[in-house]
């Protein structure tokens, strides 16, 4: 059912570097999982190239990826999630390069959302909360989160805090007074599943209060 490349095309193809990377997202759309692959070399001519996954699937032997500009994508319920699948780059019926991958080891969680920071005057601290869609999932439920914050003027001076819950307390005395801060959070699988950091959540910006001279405490905004 597939077309065949002409010999010249294949000879050219064999000279190229077809190394690729993939990540999976489980229960990303209801009960559907997704798998996204892309070539590591952005200059690869992808015109006749297709991706295919075979093995460790439910009721099918293989699945074809859809091409979305530079990325290749599958959304399906048919990942078995036990054992390794073989992912191949193909020209027609010929495989150019393949990788055996367990989809549970290349999981990229969805980005956290609803990040917010509330100042507690009496406690002299900031309560950071955020949400994650993974609390409702059957598979990738347990995540490690990386909260990163910086003073807005310090371009690359991020402070990172790792936590497993979705709530963090920042002590006021650890922050500069009367300063604008940027904070963001990302997640990575932390139990059974392995993989990659999610995208960062949208940043949240908050200002620390001024120091109240009489008590040495910061003023709330």
């Amino acid at each position: 059912e597939s077309g065949y490349a002409q010999n010249g095309d294949l000879e050219d193809a064999e000279l190229d570097d077809y190394s690729f990377s993939c990540y999976s997202q489980l229960e990303v759309n209801g009960s559907q999982h997704s798998l996204t692959c892309a070539f590591e070399d952005p200059d690869v001519n992808i015109t006749n190239l297709e991706f295919e996954i075979c093995g460790a699937l439910v009721e099918v032997k293989c699945l074809n990826f859809r091409k979305l500009q530079e990325i290749y994508f599958i959304e399906t319920k048919k990942f078995l999630l036990i054992g390794k699948s073989n992912i191949c780059v193909k020209v027609g019926e010929k495989s150019l390069t393949c990788k055996k991958i367990d989809l549970t080891t290349i999981v990229k969680p969805e980005a956290p959302f609803d990040l917010s920071v509330v100042y507690r005057e009496g406690a002299n601290d900031f309560v950071v909360t955020f949400n994650t869609s993974h609390l409702q999932k059957k598979y990738v439920k347990v995540l490690m989160h990386d909260v990163a914050y910086r003073q807005e003027k310090d371009e690359n001076k991020w402070t990172h805090v790792n936590l497993s819950s979705t709530k963090l307390t920042l002590l006021q005395r650890k922050l500069q007074p009367a300063a604008m801060y940027e904070i963001k959070v990302r997640s990575i699988p932390d139990h059974y599943f392995k993989g990659f950091w999610s995208e960062w959540s949208p940043s949240y910006y908050f200002r620390t209060p001024e120091i109240n001279n009489s008590s040495g405490e910061m003023d709330p905004i």
Partner: antibody
Framework: EVQLQQSGAELVKPGASVKLSCTVS????????IHWVKQRPEQGLEWIGR????????KYDPKFQGKATLTADTSSNTAYLQLSSLTSEDTAVYYC??????????WGQGTTLTVSS | ETTVTQSPASLSMAMGEKVTIRCMTS??????MNWYQQKPGEPPKLLIS???TLRPGVPSRFSSSGYSTDFFFTIEYMLSEDVADYFC?????????FGAGTKLELR
């Protein structure tokens, strides 16, 4: 070239059994699922079941459980459908079909089974 | 089990007319709907596979659309060679289930 070659027409008596064959070429039967579909004259298509020849794992539509038995012989690249306790309701064309991807792509030419005394 | 309801049962169309067939499913099957053409004495032929993907060699006048539970198959303009039975098949879950078919005739 992918082909599924089915055995010839059968005329059998009620109560008897019959075994239909489907020999594939152009691919390894272990790399596919083989599905079986029933089509009665002027009626729709009915899914009977499927076999994974690599593992002999089978699944049946509950309607055909006990009526149909699916087997495969990987050495001859052949799948079989056995139908038992035949009645006139089993008179139909039976197709074997390949499923590699998320669709049934190549179909055999069909075997006509007539159950009559 | 996912029930597939296909309509209409028959259609009589003039040459060049647009043909539309609908299949509805009793459960959400995402985009796992396939469309087949069958001519007398022949096995079914796959025209469009899941994800509304036109199979190689199938004329571009054939197309499909739909997602979840509601699916449409279209022949943009009817030709005499399109006289046949058409049916849909869901491959989302077992047992696989077919639509009852649409007999397309030339008026």
């Amino acid at each position: 070239e992918v082909q599924l070659q089915q055995s010839g027409a059968e005329l059998v008596k009620p109560g008897a059994s019959v075994k239909l064959s489907c020999t594939v070429s152009g691919f390894n039967i272990k790399d596919t699922y083989i599905h079986w579909v029933k089509q009665r004259p002027e009626q729709g298509l009915e899914w009977i079941g499927r076999i994974d020849p690599a593992s002999d794992d089978t699944k049946y539509d509950p309607k055909f459980q006990g009526k149909a038995t699916l087997t495969a012989d990987t050495s001859s690249n052949t799948a079989y459908l056995q139908l038992s306790s035949l009645t006139s309701e089993d008179t139909a064309v039976y197709y074997c079909v390949r499923r590699v991807y998320d669709y049934l792509d190549y179909w055999g030419q069909g075997t006509t089974l007539t159950v009559s005394s | 089990e996912t029930t597939v309801t296909q309509s209409p049962a028959s259609l009589s169309m003039a040459m060049g007319e647009k043909v539309t067939i609908r299949c509805m499913t009793s459960t959400d099957i995402n985009d796992d709907m396939n469309w087949y053409q069958q001519k007398p004495g022949e096995p079914p032929k796959l025209l469009i596979s899941e994800g509304n993907t036109l199979r190689p060699g199938v004329p571009s006048r054939f197309s499909s659309s739909g997602y979840s539970t509601d699916f449409f198959f279209t022949i943009e303009y009817m030709l005499s060679e399109d006289v046949a039975d058409y049916f849909c098949l869901q491959t989302d879950n077992l047992p696989l289930t077919f639509g009852a078919g649409t007999k397309l005739e030339l008026r």
